[in-house]
């Protein structure tokens, strides 16, 4: 069956060194346990996190995300997942794309992360 993928409409803000959560869901909501779910970064499609065959596929991750991501799957039965990124870096700023693939049918949603420096009163530079 067909569905849409919905991500946050506004940029998500994070502080360097902190963790951030990027939510993503399908509509209409349905069980996505058997689907392939992932996040990549345009324009070069570097894999941030990939979930396939009921497992996280760590081997496919870009090295800069290895050990820093976690897919929160508590609500995957309703088609809702959240990507948690730990120890946010300045280079995490920018676009992310979330996708759900059900057999040959795939839809995706773009989202944006803004990274801010908590250490300065006014971000320098």
């Amino acid at each position: 069956g067909q569905f849409r993928v919905i991500g946050p409409r506004h940029p998500i803000r994070a502080l360097v060194g902190d963790e951030v959560e990027l939510p993503c869901r399908i509509s209409p909501g349905k069980n996505a346990t058997g689907m392939e779910v992932g996040w990549y970064r345009p324009p070069f499609s570097r894999v941030v996190h990939l979930y396939r065959n009921g497992k996280d596929q760590d081997g496919d991750q870009a090295p800069e995300y290895r050990g820093r991501t976690e897919l929160l799957k508590d609500a995957i039965g309703e088609g809702k997942v959240t990507l948690r990124i730990r120890n946010v870096r300045f280079s995490d700023e920018g676009g992310f794309t979330c996708f759900f693939r059900d057999h040959s049918y795939q839809e995706e949603a773009a989202m944006e992360l803004k990274v801010e420096d908590p250490f300065y009163w006014v971000s320098p530079g």
Partner: antibody
Framework: QVQLQESGGGVVQPGRSLRLSCAAS????????MHWVRQAPGKGLEWVAV????????YYADSVKGRFTISRDNAKNTLYLQMNSLRAEDTAVYYC??????????WGQGTMVTVSS | DIQMTQSPSTLTASVGDRVTVTCRAS??????LAWYQQKPGKAPKLLIY???SLDSGVPSRFSGSGSGTEFTLTISSLQPDDFATYYC?????????FGRGTKVEIK
């Protein structure tokens, strides 16, 4: 004139404590994140800790986590590093540093800490 | 943590030579890289930030380039005052990490 001046270094026995200070002048101290960086004799530079402009946020290198505490007093324009449970490998010149480009363009002259029995 | 690998560890050169120091990050850091110069008994001095921006007062013979994981510091014509140790540092993430340094010695 923009300046950072460290003090408080000296010789201390392993397991003991020491507190370093860094006095700032010539810039708006309370707007800047402040860092400690150290350099063991004949070795390279090692980042130690950072504290946010208002003191609410702190990060540490794994090598000092749980033993060192960074703090600041914006009313006194002073940065501190409380060093507990000191080890021989903590022997180094300790620099305070900051900057307005995220890189460190302001450094103190350093204070030497020697941990020896 | 992001590891910074600097090469060479020592470089022997003459006044007037063109000198290149390389720094490689273990993971992408975009352009969040600085270069410092340090002389014996002195604090480090910032030369370059954001991979290629020259800090104020730094002579134009110093230049930086690179992005992602590969970075270069170049001294176009080595001067007597340039014999020192040079460090790269990433400030993309915490902990901030430095390269091990490159000592530029007189031939």
């Amino acid at each position: 004139q923009v300046q950072l001046q460290e003090s408080g270094g000296g010789v201390v026995q392993p397991g003991r404590s020491l507190r370093l200070s860094c006095a700032a002048s010539g810039f708006t101290f309370s707007s800047y994140g402040m860092h400690w960086v150290r350099q063991a004799p004949g070795k390279g530079l090692e980042w130690v800790a950072v504290i946010s402009y208002d003191g609410s946020k702190k990060y540490y290198a794994d090598s000092v986590k749980g033993r060192f505490t960074i703090s600041r007093d914006n009313a006194k324009n002073t940065l501190y590093l409380q060093m507990n449970s000191l080890r021989a490998e903590d022997t180094a010149v300790y620099y305070c540093a900051t900057g307005n480009s995220h890189a460190f363009d302001i450094w103190g002259q350093g204070t030497m800490v020697t941990v020896s029995s | 943590d992001i590891q910074m690998t600097q090469s060479p560890s020592t470089l022997t050169a003459s006044v007037g030579d063109r000198v290149t120091v390389t720094c490689r990050a273990s993971q992408t850091i975009n352009r969040w890289l600085a270069w410092y110069q340090q002389k014996p008994g002195k604090a480090p001095k910032l030369l370059i930030y954001l991979a290629s921006s020259l800090d104020s007062g730094v002579p134009s013979r110093f230049s930086g380039s690179g992005s992602g994981t590969e970075f270069t510091l170049t001294i176009s014509s080595l001067q007597p005052d340039d014999f020192a140790t040079y460090y790269c540092q990433q400030y993309n993430a915490y902990p901030r990490t430095f390269g091990r340094g490159t000592k530029v010695e007189i031939k």
